[in-house]
Structure formats: C-alpha cells, structure tokens
Amino acid sequence: SSSPTSSASSFSSSAPFLASAVSAQPPLPDQCPALCECSEAARTVKCVNRNLTEVPTDLPAYVRNLFLTGNQLAVLPAGAFARRPPLAELAALNLSGSRLDEVRAGAFEHLPSLRQLDLSHNPLADLSPFAFSGSNASVSAPSPLVELILNHIVPPEDERQNRSFEGMVVAALLAGRALQGLRRLELASNHFLYLPRDVLAQLPSLRHLDLSNNSLVSLTYVSFRNLTHLESLHLEDNALKVLHNGTLAELQGLPHIRVFLDNNPWVCDCHMADMVTWLKETEVVQGKDRLTCAYPEKMRNRVLLELNSADLDCDPILPPSLQTS
C-alpha cells in the first residue's frame, strides 16, 4: 500500500532537554521533536514506535513526510496538526498502528498539501463523519487527499459503537463531498459485510479501490458505473458467491479496469452461468484461471473457466407435496 516513503539518510535526533527547553516557543526551522528523527534534506520526520500519546507540537515547518507509526495516540483531536506557521508542506502522513480509537472532526484541518493519509491498523471505534472534510457543511472545501489508506481499522467486536461500522466509515468518506479528488482508497481487512450503495458514485476520481479481505457476500446493489477512471479493483478474500449480469456489464464497461477476484467461495450452480460466460470472454479479471468453485461439494476445486452450462445445474425445487420432512 502507499505509505509515505523516505529517501532520507542523515537523520538528526534531538536531545530531550533541547525540545523541552523550547517547547513554549515557535519551532525553530531545523528543530526536531523529542523522540523523533528528522532529515531536512529529505523533508522527513520519523517518530516511530516511541509510545507517543499525542502529536508533537514542535514539528519542523519543512516536514513533507511524517511518520507517526507504532505509538499510543488514542485520540486525534480537531486541529491535531494545526500549527503557526502551518505545516504547509506536509504531503504524506502515516499514523498506522498508533492505537487510535477516535478521530475527531477537523483532525486534519490546516494541512493544505496533505495528499497521502494512512490510518491503517488502528481500532477506529469512533471516526467522525467530518474527520476528513473538517466541517459539517453540506459541501465542504475540497480535501487535497489523493490517497486514503484505511486497512484494518475495524475495532474489536466489543468496542464497536451501536451502529454499522461500514456506515461510519462511509459517512466520513462522503461528508461534504470533500474527497472528490481521491484516487486511491484502501479499505482491506475491515470485516465489511456490505458496501453502502451510494459510496462509489460520490468518489468519481478513484483509480484504485482495495476491498480485499472483507466479508462481502454480494455486489448486487453496488454500482461501478461512474468510476470511469478505475484501474484496479481488489475483491480478493471476500465471501462472494457469484457476480450477476448487472455487475459484469458495469465492470466490462470500465475502460482501464483490472479486477482481482481470487479466494472467494464461488457457488457453481445455475446462477453462475452468466459469470462463467463472461469470464471466458473478458480480459479484465487478473488470474482468472485461478478462480475455482467452493460449492456445491461435488464441484469443489473445479476451475470456473473450464465449466460449461451442463455442469451448472440447480437442484429442482420440489413442490410441497413432494418434499420430505
């Protein structure tokens, strides 16, 4: 996935006494927060695996790539990165694995250049609808975000609020239509059971969508029609049983698409006929010869591409008078 990377060598590490001595003053141009490593040449600050409980206040103004991974941040409040002068250069922010369970409205405000954000591997029980849009206006100022990485952000079952996790995430993605420019969205490993039907229509710039390793059973109510720029759609490791005609036609109509469907429990009965016909003709499915039946038992491991209509039967439904109890 796309996390901020660094070409940095020559990191400088500040002494803790220096940071505390100047913490009340505006940051010096070349200052490095305590427990962080900084490279001005690479415009990179790394505060990694330091058990930080809050975002350092004295981040250098030059920072372009900020790694705050492996910490214990718990809550990201409004304006968590608001500074005077603002962090105008910050383009890539990685907060993965930092024990975040709450991201509040406006957490990423005042970051005019923020293009990549990675919140993966945080148990986000409370993601504000306005976490990315910053305001509750029906139409917000466009967010500069181009890549949003939200893999494995589902909290443990007992920590979830009494609401749909899918709904909470989607509300944050759609609020104020702020993410119209988003090109990459990764939502892997989140136990999603369904995809709310309106989400994709409002993210028209998407090039890459990763929904792998969820629990999606069906795409019947999901429309891909508006995603004319979509280049990759990852649906591996879900619970998909079959793709129906409407979905197949929409996928086929996307000019640049590559679809990944491996490791789904395909049900090879009469309802699979259209999908098999489509698979034989389409070029959009990557590794299509690796798709195999999971059910019924007599079809297990059969390669979908090698099936014909005679193989795909449905047991007849007996009239009630003929059914055994």
Epitope: D237, N263, D289, T292, A294, R300, N301, V303, E306, L307
Partner: antibody, heavy 116, light 107 residues
Framework: QVQLQQSGAELMKPGASMRLSCKAT????????LEWIKRRPGHGLEWIGE????????NYNEKFKGKATFTAETSSNTAYMQLTSLTTEDSAIYYC?????????WGQGTTLTVSS | DIQMTQSTSSLSASLGDRVTISCSAS??????LNWYQQKPDGTVKLLIY???SLHSGVPSRFSGSGSGTDYSLTISNLEPEDIAIYYC?????????FGGGTKVEMK
C-alpha cells in the same frame, strides 16, 4: 473414482534430465489444477508448482523455476514434470495431486534417486 | 513466502487419547488452511480443508479449528491407523507452503 497413477522409481546420474508422468482417471482432467509436490526426508513437503491441463497455464514455486517444467497431454489425461540438471538434492519422492484450493487426491509418488 | 511452522515435530500418545497438533503462519491466512496425513507407506490424504471442513470419507474424530495465524488439528480418540505424519498447508498466497510436519507415534 478419482485416481492418479504415477510412473515407477528412477535411478539417474547427476547432470541428467528425466520426466515423471501422472495419469489421471475418474474426473474431468482439464477442469482442475494438477499439483506437483516434493518430499525429502527431513524436509517435509514442498510445493513445486501446478498446471491447468486444458489451458497449459502454469504456476511455479520460484525455488523450482529452471529445475521443473510441467506439460500435459489432454488426449491421454496425463501430466508430466521434466526435471533438468539433476543433482543429489533432487533425490526425493515426487507426488502429483489433483488441486485447486486443496489437494484432494494424491498419486502414490515416484521415487527419484540421483547418484553417480 | 508465507512460512508455516509446526512447533512439535513428533509426539507420542496412547490409544484413545485426544491429540492436538498446532500450526502457525508467518502472517494471517484468513482460514485458508488444509491438513494432510502421510502414512508410513508414503500415501498422502487430505483430511481437513478450509480450516475446519472434513474431507469426504475422513473419520469424524478428526477436526480442525483456528483463525488468523494460529490453527490446529485434533484427533479426538486416537486409533492405531492414525499413526502418521500430519502436515498443514496454506493456500492463501502462492507459493503454497507446508508446515514441517508432526509425527504421531504410539506410546
């Protein structure tokens, strides 16, 4: 019922090449992946790779690329594995198995001994 | 490649014992795990597929469980014919990989 019958034991010289065969009966040969697995004492089982006979598609374990080559003859329902530039490390029992997500039927294995 | 580790290479048990064999993956494999039995004569059979599904013809004393990276095979009531080497195998990602095997012997 499904059966996979493998060719008999072989004694080969280092540097030689050889071809093992696996004849499938009792199922649609072209409809399933056919796997090849190596077993050596102290090394357990190693997946070499697989072939989809109807299409000739193959997947190889990187470790065996250049060592093993898979082919299949659909007219006789037989899969083959060619092993080249044999060394003593290639001495093992080689299995074919009907594959996919699990290997539900296995051949009896072919013992290959490489010795000068 | 995903590494599969069977921490116990051999174990001894008595007839009728409950035997549990463990297997761990170097990363999450999403229940994409199978168990095989290799008899002393070299024959290999599938016992359990997709973590917990019993392959047809396999006695019900065999069962599988697990999730994420940790999986196990249980023989609830050991019989003489269960003397064998047991292998786990992941099919989450190519290349498919096997554990090193656990040899079950009679006390």
């Amino acid at each position: 019922q499904v059966q996979l019958q493998q060719s008999g034991a072989e004694l080969m010289k280092p540097g030689a090449s050889m071809r093992l065969s696996c004849k499938a009966t009792g199922y649609t040969f072209t409809g399933y992946w056919l796997e090849w697995i190596k077993r050596r004492p102290g090394h357990g089982l190693e997946w070499i790779g697989e072939i989809l006979p109807g299409r000739g598609s193959t997947n190889y374990n990187e470790k065996f690329k250049g060592k093993a080559t898979f082919t299949a003859e659909t007219s006789s329902n037989t899969a083959y594995m060619q092993l080249t530039s044999l060394t003593t490390e290639d001495s093992a029992i080689y299995y074919c198995a009907r594959g996919g997500r699990d290997f539900d039927n296995w051949g009896q294995g072919t013992t290959l001994t490489v010795s000068s | 490649d995903i590494q599969m580790t069977q921490s116990t290479s051999s174990l001894s048990a008595s007839l009728g014992d409950r035997v549990t064999i463990s297997c761990s993956a170097s990363q999450g494999i999403n229940n994409h795990l199978n168990w095989y039995q290799q008899k002393p004569d070299g024959t290999v059979k599938l016992l359990i597929y997709y973590t917990s599904s019993l392959h047809s013809g396999v006695p019900s004393r065999f069962s599988g469980s697990g999730s994420g990276t940790d999986y196990s095979l249980t023989i609830s009531n050991l019989e003489p014919e269960d003397i064998a080497i047991y292998y786990c195998q992941q099919f989450s990602k190519l290349p498919y990989t096997f554990g090193g095997g656990t040899k079950v012997e009679m006390k």
